[in-house]
């Protein structure tokens, strides 16, 4: 007794095609590209039915159902738009990811994804992972370089990368991306094994204000070349935050220097240091202060720190100096770890050129200069830490 002639489901075909199917004959169903075999709601790898002696097939006919990639994943700091039609997530449907304007920019691809036959949303480059909305760095309300100790009060949005670090002593740092803080090794050395002890605050101008964005540290990475109590060479550290912060006009990361950045950091070029450190009155500043200071010739700075009480070789090639020969403008205790920033006139973005590290016992002293960790020397170290963790 032959079995009923198998009618292929829509978007599928039967193989082999025979005039009739008798006992032990079989057929398979193959779906067109973009369709998958489903038995009920369950996907099948393959389908073969065998004709039984009672003249029936041993399995019910499956469906060839259009591949459904499902609702696309949410994009952190971004959004998704259905291009093909509202909520359409099936084969060949198109969606468009975009990032929140102003403060984020899309990395990896152009954000256009298509539902492919394998059931994955796939970019035009073939990527199945989400694009990345990366914070825009170096945006500031302060647009001029030119004309804290001997400094002036910062205004909202001037230094949105500024981070206040509490835990032991008062120190500073600069936001990188949306979950890292760049600072000085000596500022966080005591907390390197107790990262959670660091109280990290951002988005505020007033040191004592209750209105700030709180962040907590997940891990502290101190440069392996830094030796506590033996000078300040390699005085650089990274703090990984346990959560990403939301970027806005008051919280924005600083850019890392491009390869070409040294052209904006020559002798007499103006950098800007900011912080809540000691002012001329000898107290920690209540309001965030900043000072515009010129870069000092490296040999001149080295010579200034060659005489006692400073040991020979205090100033290394991993440092840069800034300040006025006449004194009066400087970073000071409590500013440690903060960024010395420069305006990249080509990109119109601010970047971190130095990290407040050390200086003379008396801040702003004539003939002495503030010494900063030279960030451009540590770009590979920074990039390795951030990519590995």
């Amino acid at each position: 007794q032959p079995c009923p002639y198998p009618m292929a489901p829509p978007n599928g075909h039967v193989s082999p095609v025979q005039a009739k199917y008798i006992l032990k004959d079989s057929f398979s169903i193959f779906c067109e590209t973009g369709y998958e075999l489903l038995q009920g709601h369950l996907p099948l790898k393959s389908f073969t039915a065998v004709c039984q002696k009672d003249g029936s097939w041993d399995r019910p006919m499956p469906a060839c159902s259009i591949v459904d990639c499902g609702p696309p994943d949410d994009l952190p700091s971004g959004r998704v738009e259905y291009i093909t039609g509202p909520g359409v997530t099936t084969y060949k449907a198109v969606i468009q990811y975009s990032c929140e304007e102003t403060f984020y920019t899309m990395k990896v691809n152009d954000g256009k994804y298509v539902c492919e036959a394998d059931g994955f949303w796939t970019s035009s480059k073939g990527e199945k992972s989400l694009p990345v909305c990366e914070p825009v760095c170096g945006l500031s309300a302060k647009t001029t370089g030119g004309r804290i100790y001997g400094g002036q009060k910062a205004k909202p949005g001037d230094f949105p990368w500024q981070v206040l670090i509490l835990g032991g002593t008062t120190a500073a740092g600069a936001l990188l991306y949306d979950n890292w803080v760049l600072t000085a090794a000596h500022a966080v050395y005591e907390q390197k094994h107790d990262a959670s002890a660091l109280d990290i605050r951002m988005g505020t101008l007033k040191r004592l204000s209750p209105h700030y964005t709180q962040a907590w540290s997940e891990a502290v990475f101190i440069h392996e070349g830094y030796t506590h109590d033996a000078g300040f060479d390699n005085d650089i550290a990274l703090i990984k935050l346990n959560n990403k912060v939301v970027i806005n006009s008051n919280i924005t990361p600083i850019c890392l220097p491009r390869k070409e950045a040294e052209s904006f950091m020559r002798t007499d070029d103006i950098g800007t240091a900011s912080g809540w450190g000691l002012t001329q009155r000898g107290f920690l500043a209540r309001n965030l202060m900043y000072v515009d200071i010129p870069i000092v010739d490296h040999q001149k700075c080295t010579a200034a720190y060659e005489k006692p009480p400073y040991p020979r070789g205090s100033v290394t090639a991993n440092m840069l100096c800034a300040g006025l020969e006449s004194g009066g403008k400087d970073a000071c205790r409590g500013d440690s770890g903060g960024a010395l920033v420069f305006l990249d006139s080509e990109t119109e973005r601010w970047f971190v050129g130095g990290i407040v590290s050390w200086g003379s016992m008396n801040c702003g002293e004539a003939g002495q200069y503030g010494v900063y960790t030279k960030v451009i020397n540590y770009i590979p170290w920074i990039e390795n830490i951030i990519s590995d963790f």
């Epitope: 489903l38 038995q39 009920g40 709601h41 369950l42 996907p43 099948l44 790898k45 393959s46 459904d68 499902g70 609702p71 997530t89 059931g119």
Partner: antibody, heavy 118, light 107 residues
């Protein structure tokens, strides 16, 4: 993102009926893309699938439990429910609800512990 | 009734590759799924339809399935991968789970 939350009594007497509800938030239970499933895990043991339901009411049950299980759906409340009758101590387990998308369970609820004891 | 068998436990050193197997009659003819469950937590899907990885699951997780055996492979195993792993398949529209494998990451 869709989240699931199980609720119901943590203690049921032997021979009575265990009743649990799963509330879906962040998405519609009426989506044509999904079934919704129940899975349980006795203390210190492995996972056991109980059954799955579509928003229209279509169900699949584990044959070993089929005679005692009823899964229903309430689209107006964005909930689906499990009833397991004639329970014994062997039904003591953490009961999970999960979204069943073409056979894969993702995501899962946090689970609720149900103890069968007099 | 259909059964899926897994080794109850296995251990691996950090950075090494862990291969967790799941065997069942003609398992390669149907799709296998893998779930990770950490103590006190709900299971999380790590592989579906033999070798597909949901978004958010690290690339070190991969899967294969042929013959009578499905395999979950974790390359460059990390301490955070220590968990119970369950395979699952659908046979005749019935969901079946393996007994689970406890993966211990040494050190």
């Amino acid at each position: 993102q869709v989240q699931l939350q199980e609720s119901g009594p943590g203690l049921v007497k032997p021979s009575e009926t265990l009743s649990l509800t799963c509330t879906v938030s962040g998405g519609s239970i009426s989506s044509s893309s999904y079934y919704w499933g129940w899975i349980r895990q006795p203390p210190g043991k492995g996972l056991e699938w109980i059954g799955s339901i579509y928003y229209s009411g279509s169900t699949y049950y584990n044959p070993s439990l089929k005679s005692r299980v009823t899964i229903s759906v309430d689209t107006s409340k964005n909930q689906f429910s499990l009833k397991l009758s004639s329970v014994t101590a062997a039904d003591t387990a953490v009961y999970y609800c999960a979204r069943d998308r073409r056979g894969r369970f993702d995501p899962w609820g946090q689970g609720t512990m149900v103890t069968v004891s007099s | 009734s259909y059964e899926l068998m897994q080794p109850p436990s296995m251990s691996v050193s950090p950075g090494q590759t862990a291969s967790i197997t799941c065997s069942g009659d003609k398992l390669g003819d149907i799709y296998a799924y893998w779930y990770q469950q950490k103590p006190g937590q709900s299971p999380v899907l790590v592989i579906y339809q033999d070798n597909k990885r949901p978004s958010g699951i690290p690339e070190r997780f991969s899967g294969s399935n042929s013959g009578n055996t499905a395999t979950l492979t974790i390359s460059g195993t990390q301490a955070m991968d220590e968990a119970d792993y369950y395979c699952q398949a659908w046979e005749s529209s019935t969901g079946v789970f393996g007994g689970g494998t406890k993966l211990t990451v040494l050190g």
